[in-house]
Interface confidence: medium
Amino acid sequence: CKAMHVAQPAVVLASSRGIASFVCEYASPGKATEVRVTVLRQADSQVTEVCAATYMMGNELTFLDDSICTGTSSGNQVNLTIQGLRAMDTGLYICKVELMYPPPYYLGIGNGTQIYVIDPEPCPDSDF
């Protein structure tokens, strides 16, 4: 297993609609044709898998239908969007990239993006 550098922003603020987007960029040491991207969330002593997608270079990322993630790829970077976030989902979101094929296998784990989610204030009753 060979190490690979993965870069991602340190902090992202989710929109009022609970959507957060960030770029995950990896320094590909070889000519990978198949790449796997996993988003992990670390909170306290727990690491949970948020979503994962495997894609062929040049093609779109395909997450599972019920996934809260969507994404697009361009060269050695992946634009990830996580939807449906609430304040309780605030945490460190880590991008894990695996170059699956052809060999050799490379693994890279980013330092994480701290996503802050603020629940919107309920709108007061209005006559307007």
Partner: antibody
Framework: EVQLVESGGGLVQPGGSLRLSCAAS????????MSWVRQAPGKGLEWVSA????????YYADSVKGRFTISRDNSKNTLYLQMNSLRAEDTAVYYC???????????WGQGTLVTVSS | DIQMTQSPSSLSASVGDRVTITCRAS??????LGWYQQKPGKAPKRLIY???SLQSGVPPRFSGSGSGTEFTLTISSLQPEDFATYYC?????????FGGGTKVEIK
């Protein structure tokens, strides 16, 4: 309360097959990677295999690669280990563990004994 | 593959003693190391994660330190229930590898 309960162990002849199961409860199973770890009688711990939460990524120890297959059914909260071409050296207690990746294993099952002997 | 060399393989100590167990990784693993306690016939139990973080519910007499290639588990004052076998585990990269174990026995 997190619970992991292994089953499916038993006596099998060399060259035979066995499928182990690990029923999980008390946590959102699909959010977590899972691993199998084994321990031969009187020996130390040996990691066997791991699978990511969504089941997309699988990993194996060299000693079982090509013979064992890890899988999971998230709708049933169950982890599996299909073991083929079993050898005497596969005799061990097999544990499933909730895998927090670089933070290690926070919960383990009680183990199930697999004995490979003629 | 990353090899984990654990020492000593066994030790005899008395209640109240300070006990130190060492694990050395064959290559740098950041702080991606845990310590596990196992008693006969039982599943292992995590004591320390991320080299130095104490698992919830584990007594504070257990502590871990180290980063890179050298790691230490310390029991500050050995208690009767601490007589067991201890393993380190690197979870930096696959295949995951355990140390050979340290059996702590009563002197």
């Amino acid at each position: 309360e997190v619970q992991l309960v292994e089953s499916g162990g038993g006596l099998v002849q060399p060259g035979g097959s066995l499928r182990l199961s690990c029923a999980a409860s008390g946590f959102t199973f699909s959010n977590y990677a899972m691993s199998w770890v084994r321990q031969a009688p009187g020996k130390g711990l040996e990691w066997v295999s791991a699978i990511s939460g969504g089941g997309l990524s699988t990993y194996y120890a060299d000693s079982v690669k090509g013979r064992f297959t890890i899988s999971r059914d998230n709708s049933k909260n169950t982890l599996y280990l299909q073991m083929n071409s079993l050898r005497a050296e596969d005799t061990a207690v097999y544990y499933c563990a909730k895998d927090l990746l670089w933070l290690g294993f926070d919960y383990w099952g009680q183990g199930t004994l697999v004995t490979v002997s003629s | 593959d990353i090899q984990m060399t654990q020492s000593p393989s066994s030790l005899s100590a008395s209640v109240g003693d300070r006990v130190t167990i060492t694990c050395r990784a064959s290559q740098a693993i950041r702080n991606d190391l845990g310590w596990y306690q196992q008693k006969p016939g039982k599943a292992p139990k995590r004591l320390i994660y991320a080299a130095s973080s104490l698992q919830s519910g584990v007594p504070p007499r257990f502590s871990g330190s180290g980063s890179g290639t050298e790691f230490t588990l310390t029991i500050s004052s050995l208690q009767p229930e601490d007589f067991a076998t201890y393993y380190c585990l690197q979870h930096n990269s696959y295949p995951l590898t355990f140390g050979g174990g340290t059996k702590v026995e009563i002197k």
